[in-house]
Amino acid sequence: QRLSRAQQQLPLESLGWDIAELQLNHTGPQQDPRLYWQGGPALGRSFLRGPELDKGQLRIRRDGIYMVHIQVTLAICSSTSTSRHHHPTTLAVGICSPASRSISLLRLSFHQGCTIASQRLTPLARGDTLCTNLTGTLLPSRNTDETFFGVQWVRP
Amino acid sequence: QRLSRAQQQLPLESLGWDIAELQLNHTGPQQDPRLYWQGGPALGRSFLRGPELDKGQLRIRRDGIYMVHIQVTLAICSSTSTSRHHHPTTLAVGICSPASRSISLLRLSFHQGCTIASQRLTPLARGDTLCTNLTGTLLPSRNTDETFFGVQWVRP
Amino acid sequence: QRLSRAQQQLPLESLGWDIAELQLNHTGPQQDPRLYWQGGPALGRSFLRGPELDKGQLRIRRDGIYMVHIQVTLAICSSTSTSRHHHPTTLAVGICSPASRSISLLRLSFHQGCTIASQRLTPLARGDTLCTNLTGTLLPSRNTDETFFGVQWVRP
């Protein structure tokens, strides 16, 4: 898609560059596998510049292709604690609303590890809300260098 | 932050785009957990375009939000070699100077694996020096496809 | 490298922004360790905007520094299935043609895990074809949230 002359003359900011890096606030109540995120300079090195938080979930405000990345570290963890469960603890990042666009974007299991980390490019639309679901009973670390979730707009 | 008319008229290079991809040079002496990096076309596919190296540590020369990424593979490694240690080998990336800005940005343990890889968005300032600390006695691979560390300026 | 006045005045599209996110199509026949990829909106959330596919391998059409990322999940996998093999299953991403530029860019072993994920910055040139080689007998998952491969042009 070509950029209009007006877009070329506006600051590059106006082209997009929406970006966010979030830290873990807390896990959900029982039966709610979602992780709840928070961000802002008062909290440390997390920030929201464009996207916004809606009850701890990340909402996109600009259409485009985004790089989505996540790292989650389990808080009290050893190779045995992750492997002794019948079902491995799994982390899934997906669009959870609007329901019509619901889809899993990124899925990782811990198996015998205590940290998962990955990233991917994906198209996102204004209003898409991203949820990060952690299945199982193991608790994620709230340390900001161990558990974080972010998106970066990379092109229209 | 709005970009000035002058900034808009300069080549996009001048907006930032600082970028570096480094390969492992060597580990530190005993009691120094830092990894020492090197970069430049003469060495292969590593490069520094903006950031610089100071005694093997990466120094930032432009304020902004950066994508920091790292992969470290242990050289002589099996699932048993990483799991039989009382403490898992751990890799931490952080700002180590200036001391007033010292903080851990990214932390991963190997547990029963032989490679860690992750990435995150973080604000960095001119003069920040990034250190990568590898705790434990296991040695990292110097293969350029197995161990590397990089940063990419993504926005002001 | 400075951008010409013409480049500055063209839409930002023309500066680069080549990008692709691919999903797994199939593995190769015996003796061919390559993974074969596919992309396009008809397939889901995968896409090619600049790079192109040549018999399931990704070919670069614009010189520059790229962020290359990959995640591969083994389909029928447990910690024991990856560890009981004498040689760990390994994934390597490299330039496979032209032969004169053949090199391994990124290498990861599964050890006792069932997913690998990583990313790196690397210079690529027009005509470089990237191959992703999976050694071993284990089969990768074709789920689009578990196995994907992408590149993003980040600067000249």
Epitope: C77, C114, L139, S141, N143 | T135 | -
Partner: antibody
Amino acid sequence: QVQLQESGPGLVKPSQTLSLTCTVSGDSIISGGYYWSWIRQHPGKGLEWIGYIFYSGSTDYNPSLKSRVTISVDTSKNQFSLKLSSVTAADTAVYYCARSGYSYALFDHWGQGTLVTVSS
Amino acid sequence: DIQMTQSPSSLSASVGDRVTISCRASQFIGRYFNWYQQQPGKAPKVLIYAESSLQSGVPSRFSGSGSGTEFTLTISSLQPEDFARYYCQQSYSTPWTFGQGTKVEIK
């Protein structure tokens, strides 16, 4: 078996500095997997976290004591230390050193505690 | 700081009794919550971590539950060695804080 052992004077005069050392055995502070904390317990009262140190020397202190507390580490001796300045009778307590995980603040190993009395 | 308020401050019970101790956090802390037992003259030891996980070696008569701000430690059948002081602690954010303690005495 991880063991922590506090040592230092049991009696300190008001306005002086309380100094204690914790020696760790069965574990290496430099391994980097844990925070090393000081916790105190006033006679017949609850537990109060004073602060922690990481092998790298980074610290975090309880704001209520921050202006008077310094925690340091000597990885070569596998020890960490507490200094509390300008003490008063209100600092009389049993002082414990303890280990907690980096990823989760669970105090899984403690010293046996040492009673420090502030009195002239 | 997050305040942790325990109740009761003391209770009397007999061997075989079912005992519950409560702890309230001044803000939501999720499952970042632990229980300790302290015998007279000894250091505390972990009973329950992450709200409801039993520490290795701790008898199964101890259990924990919670709702993010309200937490309960239950001893299903009190044993002679359970007469001690119990503390709650939050692991949500520094400064790490403890409850004031609950003393379980013999009736």
